[in-house]
Amino acid sequence: ECGQPSRSLPSLVKRIIGGRNAEPGLFPWQALIVVEDTSRVPNDKWFGSGALLSESWILTAAHVLRSQRRDTTVIPVSKEHVTVYLGLHDVRDKSGAVNSSAARVVLHPDFNIQNYNHDIALVQLQEPVPLGPHVMPVCLPRLEPEGPSPHMLGLVAGWGISNPNVTVDEIISSGTRTLSDVLQYVKLPVVPHAECKTSYESRSGNYSVTENMFCAGYYEGGKDTCLGDSGGAFVILDDLSQRWVVQGLVSWGGPEECGSKQVYGVYTKVSNYVDWVWEQMGSPQGRAPGGTVS
């Protein structure tokens, strides 16, 4: 079953300021995606997050899985360069985590590197991962163009929230100490589309908040997703089923520091891509190992 952690997620009544350490098993769908692109000299290394949809599939943002050296072209990384960690809590201690290589890397065919429209991708794992208390899929939303309603509260987790100055090598190698060794999470409200659009249109630079995106965060700043959180799931508790649903994927934000005032985080609106996701996974919704909330 999807979207039901063995450990109950925190109540959404109280607002969290900044990020908090997650308890192990709180976000059992959370994946750390490590990319080492050896096709370039010297090798490029970076990381992002993703969400487990089934024993074999990870949902993430397309920009996490594209080569970093040609900023105006979309070159998917080779599957050989991708490693996925599941059941990971502390990046310094990968011993308890399941690591898997990729069998396939699938970027959305319309992903636009200029404005990050259609920023969604899938990784098929080489071998199905065993599910358990710390490794469980999240639910996909219903197919609905509106996406999550304004002011709804959601949670997003990642290893990049605490310290935007941490180097990639520090995150990837297990022996180093950083401020975001332990998975962090933050609670954020969905921002009305018009408000977010206006906020970005008023900035210098060519920012486009499309209908395939939604925003989350606080006007006053102070809590946000940041570098290294890309591709991570923005989850909302579905009232009817009481399951956690991936409504968004960490996509982009303004040029200011993470958590700046009136700079909302922008997320891929997953509900616009449910059909595409099922099509790639090759399983009709009814027989899906994870599932869609009904």
Partner: antibody, heavy 113, light 112 residues
Framework: QVQLKQSGAELMKPGASVKLSCKAT????????IEWVKQRPGHGLEWIGE????????NYNEKFKGKATFTADSSSNTAYMQLSSLTTEDSAMYYC??????WGTGTTVTVSS | DIVMTQSPSSLAVSAGEKVTMSCKSS????????????LAWYQQKPGQSPKLLIY???TRESGVPDRFTGSGSGTDFTLTISSVQAEDLAVYYC????????FGGGTKLEIK
């Protein structure tokens, strides 16, 4: 060690095509991008484009689209660049390089009637 | 395209002197995901192919003498030769690979 050996100098007529080769040794040829660069006196260095031999993926500088075509033969560890519809502007030294680091020996192309 | 501007276009120094040359890009070369500046420095001696000296703006390629140092981030970069040797006579080019690669016009180093 990594080496890129390029084919010999070419003297060509305007309108003709030429195919330059770049043979790689000392590393796994299929796994690294091969870039091509043009150098003309007084014009500095210009990036033409690149190919990833293992997949055949290519990227071209807009300026050279339609002029240059990249191919690669994994069995002989050789990358090729074909230049078509040659003009005197194509007279230059052409280099291949392994993504960023090691440069080939260079091939001089002269276009003259 | 990202425009790379090198200065000076040429300079002449005596052996043993310190020399610095500049490379400026029309936009930032710092990739926020890999946290690297995609800027390389190459040395091209007369009649030879270019040779990589520095990558990621400040990492010296193996085998390159430690008198060569790269520095800078974002849009402003510098190559410093702490004590110029006669064999350093060459043209020095910077290249960005953040986007479709472009080269600077080069700095020609002459030895007095």
């Amino acid at each position: 060690q990594v080496q890129l050996k390029q084919s010999g100098a070419e003297l060509m007529k305007p309108g003709a095509s030429v195919k330059l080769s770049c043979k790689a040794t000392g590393y796994t040829f299929t796994g690294k991008w091969i870039e091509w660069v043009k150098q003309r006196p007084g014009h500095g260095l210009e990036w033409i484009g690149e190919i990833l031999p293992g997949t055949g993926s290519t990227n071209y500088n807009e300026k050279f689209k339609g002029k240059a075509t990249f191919t690669a033969d994994s069995s002989s560890n050789t990358a090729y660049m074909q230049l078509s519809s040659l003009t005197t502007e194509d007279s230059a030294m052409y280099y291949c390089l392994r993504s960023e680091d090691v440069w080939g020996t260079g091939t001089t192309v002269t276009v003259s009637s | 395209d990202i425009v790379m501007t090198q200065s000076p276009s040429s300079l002449a120094v005596s052996a043993g002197e310190k020399v610095t040359m500049s490379c400026k890009s029309s936009q930032s070369l710092l990739n926020s995901r890999t946290r690297k500046n995609y800027l390389a420095w190459y040395q091209q001696k007369p009649g030879q192919s270019p040779k990589l000296l520095i990558y990621w703006a400040s990492t010296r390629e193996s085998g390159v003498p430690d008198r060569f140092t790269g520095s800078g981030s974002g849009t402003d970069f510098t190559l410093t030769i702490s004590s110029v040797q006669a064999e350093d006579l060459a043209v020095y080019y910077c290249k960005q690979s953040y986007n479709i690669p472009t080269f600077g016009g080069g700095t020609k180093l002459e030895i007095k």
